[in-house]
C-alpha cells in the first residue's frame, strides 16, 4: 500500500531572466527512493539516480543545475519555461509518486508582488 505523500515548493511566479529552485519532498513512507525524474510536459529534464547520481538532459545542460538535494535549479528563465513540472519519485517497494509544480515566467514588471493585472 502506498502511504507516502509528496510535498512541493508550491507553484511559482518568477521573473524572466531569473532563476528558481523546484523541490519535492517525499514523506510518510519508509520506501527507498531509487530514482527521481524531473519532467516538463513530456520532456525529461533531469534524473537523479541513487547509485549513478545526476544526469541532465543535453538540451537543458546550459540552464539546469542539479540540487539542492533532489531538487532542480532552473536558470536564465524565459517565457517558454512557463508550464507544469513533475517530480517523479521511483521507490521500492511502494512504486511511483508524482508531485506537480506550475511555473509561470513573467516579464519583470509583473512578476510576483509587481502584478497588478491592469497591464494589457
Amino acid at each position: 500500500m502506498m502511504t507516502g505523500t509528496i510535498e512541493t515548493t508550491g507553484n511559482i511566479s518568477a521573473e524572466k531572466g531569473g532563476s528558481i529552485i523546484l523541490q519535492c519532498h517525499l514523506s510518510s513512507t519508509t520506501a527507498q527512493v531509487t530514482q527521481v525524474n524531473w519532467e516538463q510536459q513530456d520532456q525529461l529534464l533531469a534524473i537523479c539516480n541513487a547509485d549513478l547520481g545526476w544526469h541532465i538532459s543535453p538540451s537543458f545542460k546550459d540552464r539546469v543545475a542539479p540540487g539542492p538535494g533532489l531538487g532542480l535549479t532552473l536558470q536564465s528563465l524565459t517565457v517558454n519555461d512557463t508550464g507544469e513540472y513533475f517530480c517523479i519519485y521511483h521507490t521500492y517497494p511502494d512504486g511511483t509518486y508524482t508531485g506537480r509544480i506550475f511555473l509561470e515566467v513573467l516579464e519583470s514588471s509583473v512578476a510576483e508582488h509587481g502584478a497588478r493585472f491592469q497591464i494589457p
Epitope: G10, V79, T82
Partner: antibody, heavy 117, light 112 residues
C-alpha cells in the same frame, strides 16, 4: 478593454463531444494563461485546467483529464475546450477566465451545456 | 488535492453590516518563496464570477475599499465593512499555490 467572448449555449446528446470557444480581445493573448472553470447547476466552482497560449502547454485537474481537452489558436486569439463522451454529469455552465499569478482576473460570460437525449 | 473549507455556508445580513468570511486550507498556501496565491471572487446570479482580491490582500482594479483580505498559512479572511445591495451573491476563495487549483465551497451572502 479586456473581453472574453464565449460561444453560445449547447444542447447535446449523451456520448457526443462538443467544443466551446473563448475569443479574447483587449490584451496580449500570449502574455497570460487561460483557465477553464465548471459550475454544475446550483453547485460550486471547479477548476478544470489551464492552457499557456504562448507554448500550447496545458495543466489539468486530474478529475478532468480525459474529459476536457484545451487548445488555442494564437492567430485568432481564441481558446477552446473540447468536452468528450458527454454524460448528464457534464451538464453545467463552463467559463473561460484569463489568469496570471494564479488568480483569474477576467471571465467570459459562460457557456451553458445541457446533455440530454 | 488541497481541500479548501469556507465558513459560514450562508450569511444573512442587513445593509450596512460588517461581515467576515473564513477560508481554511488543508495545507499551507505559502510557497517556498513566501508567496501565497489565495484569491476571492464574488459570483452574482446571472453574471460571471468577478475577482475581488488576489495574493491574500491585493484589491483588484475597481474593487471598492470596503473589501479587504487578510491571513497567512492556512487561515484567510475576507472582510466587507459596509454591506451594500450589490454585494449580495456567492463568495468563493481559490487557492492557486498547489496543483490543481481548488475553490472553497462558497458562502452565500443574503438579506436577513
Amino acid at each position: 478593454e479586456v473581453q472574453l467572448q464565449q460561444s453560445g449555449p449547447e444542447l447535446v446528446k449523451p456520448g457526443a463531444s462538443m467544443k466551446i470557444s473563448c475569443k479574447a480581445s483587449g490584451y496580449s493573448f500570449t502574455g497570460y494563461t487561460m483557465s477553464w472553470v465548471k459550475q454544475s447547476h446550483g453547485k460550486n466552482l471547479e477548476w478544470i485546467g489551464l492552457i499557456i497560449p504562448y507554448t500550447g502547454g496545458t495543466s489539468y485537474s486530474q478529475k478532468f483529464k480525459g474529459k476536457a481537452t484545451l487548445t488555442v489558436d494564437k492567430s485568432s486569439t481564441t481558446a477552446y475546450m473540447e468536452l468528450l463522451s458527454l454524460t448528464s454529469e457534464d451538464s453545467a455552465v463552463y467559463y473561460c477566465a484569463r489568469s496570471r499569478t494564479f488568480a483569474m482576473d477576467y471571465w467570459g460570460q459562460g457557456t451553458s451545456v445541457t446533455v440530454s437525449s | 488535492d488541497v481541500v479548501v473549507t469556507q465558513t459560514p455556508l450562508s450569511l444573512p445580513v442587513s445593509f450596512g453590516d460588517q461581515v467576515s468570511i473564513s477560508c481554511r486550507s488543508s495545507q499551507s498556501l505559502a510557497n517556498s518563496y513566501g508567496n501565497t496565491y489565495l484569491s476571492w471572487y464574488l459570483h452574482k446570479p446571472g453574471q460571471s464570477p468577478q475577482l475581488l482580491i488576489y495574493g491574500i490582500s491585493n484589491r483588484f482594479s475597481g474593487v471598492p475599499d470596503r473589501f479587504s483580505g487578510s491571513g497567512s498559512g492556512t487561515d484567510f479572511t475576507l472582510k466587507i465593512s459596509t454591506i451594500k445591495p450589490e454585494d449580495l451573491g456567492m463568495y468563493y476563495c481559490l487557492q492557486g499555490t498547489h496543483q490543481p487549483w481548488t475553490f472553497g465551497g462558497g458562502t452565500k451572502l443574503e438579506i436577513k
